[in-house]
Amino acid sequence: RADPCAARPCAHGGRCYAHFSGLVCACAPGYMGARCEFPVHPDGASALPAAPPGLRPGDPQR
């Protein structure tokens, strides 16, 4: 199958892994989201409109 990480989909230094569901990003500290596109604010809040519960800064998301 096509390489899901070919286009470097993980932003801000995120590390891309081919996964069962396609790809997964390991986000660098300070970023979150499925493609590490959302910065984590200093107060711990994120730029996500509605952050899914249980998210941690830098936690890889599918």
């Epitope: 199958r1 390489d3 899901p4 990480c5 070919a6 286009a7 470097r8 230094g13 590390r15 891309c16 892994y17 081919a18 996964h19 997964v24 390991a26 660098a28 500290p29 941690r56 830098g58 936690d59 890889p60």
Partner: antibody, heavy 123, light 111 residues
Framework: QEQLVESGGGLVQPEGSLTLTCTAS?????????MCWVRQAPGKGLEWIAC????????TDYANWAKGRFSISKTSSTTVTLQMTSLTVADTATYFC???????????????WGPGTLVTVSS | QVLTQTPSPVSAAVGGTVTISCQAS????????LAWYQQKPGQPPKLLIY???SLASGVPSRFKGSGAGTQFTLTISDLECDDAATYYC????????????FGGGTEVVVK
């Protein structure tokens, strides 16, 4: 069955160069995260050297001490090489190829290793 | 970043328990990106524990990992002769790039 085998080790003179090859069987790199090199000097501990994305992006990560003298590259969907230059006696070690997989939100999990290839730097 | 392990060797009798500690000079990625490996002479390392406390496939439950942040522990209970080996912790970090570091290793002697 999934397997890694290293080759290219041997005796090299100080200041010399050497290229090691890691060959995979039973799987292809593009579906397996990252491929990495780790070394172990005789009687000493493990030392991470570098990793390269198994996919076509070619993304690489290096230990600070390895930058400049060591170069990792993917030459096919089943082979990765480690080019080493300006070798010194301190580079004498068994060099292992290892697969880095993503498991439960963690990375750099080396769940498959080759048997290693010995590099001896001596005059 | 430095990972400091319990000095070698650590010894215990068959059926006993050994505990190996791994102290990181700074928190590992996500506070839990730490793995443990077992290595026997002439063999490559074998992944035992990932995510600080999760057992790798095929590893017996006698092996237990715990800890978070900078302090981690590997406990081997009901020791068997086959457990005689050197054990390494491995932490992952990010600082302008990803990198990984191994502890110095701890030899376990089974009497």
């Amino acid at each position: 069955q999934e397997q890694l085998v290293e080759s290219g080790g041997g005796l090299v003179q100080p200041e010399g160069s050497l290229t090691l090859t890691c060959t995979a069987s039973g799987f292809s790199f593009s579906s397996s995260g990252y491929m990495c090199w780790v070394r172990q000097a005789p009687g000493k501990g493990l030392e991470w050297i570098a990793c390269i994305s198994g996919g076509s992006s070619g993304d690489t990560d290096y230990a600070n001490w390895a930058k400049g003298r060591f170069s990792i590259s993917k030459t096919s969907s089943t082979t990765v090489t480690l080019q080493m230059t300006s070798l010194t006696v301190a580079d004498t070690a068994t060099y292992f190829c290892a697969r880095d997989v993503y498991i439960d939100s963690t990375i750099f999990n080396f769940n498959l290793w080759g048997p290693g290839t010995l590099v001896t730097v001596s005059s | 970043q430095v990972l400091t392990q319990t000095p070698s060797p650590v010894s215990a009798a068959v059926g006993g328990t050994v505990t190996i500690s791994c102290q990181a000079s700074q928190s590992v990625y996500n506070n839990n990106n730490l793995a443990w490996y077992q290595q026997k002479p002439g063999q490559p390392p074998k992944l035992l524990i990932y995510a600080a406390s999760s057992l790798a496939s095929g590893v017996p439950s006698r092996f237990k990992g715990s800890g978070a942040g900078t302090q981690f522990t590997l406990t081997i209970s009901d020791l068997e002769c086959d457990d005689a080996a050197t054990y390494y912790c491995q932490g992952t970090y990010y600082s302008s790039g990803w990198y990984s570091t191994f502890g110095g290793g701890t030899e376990v002697v089974v009497k």
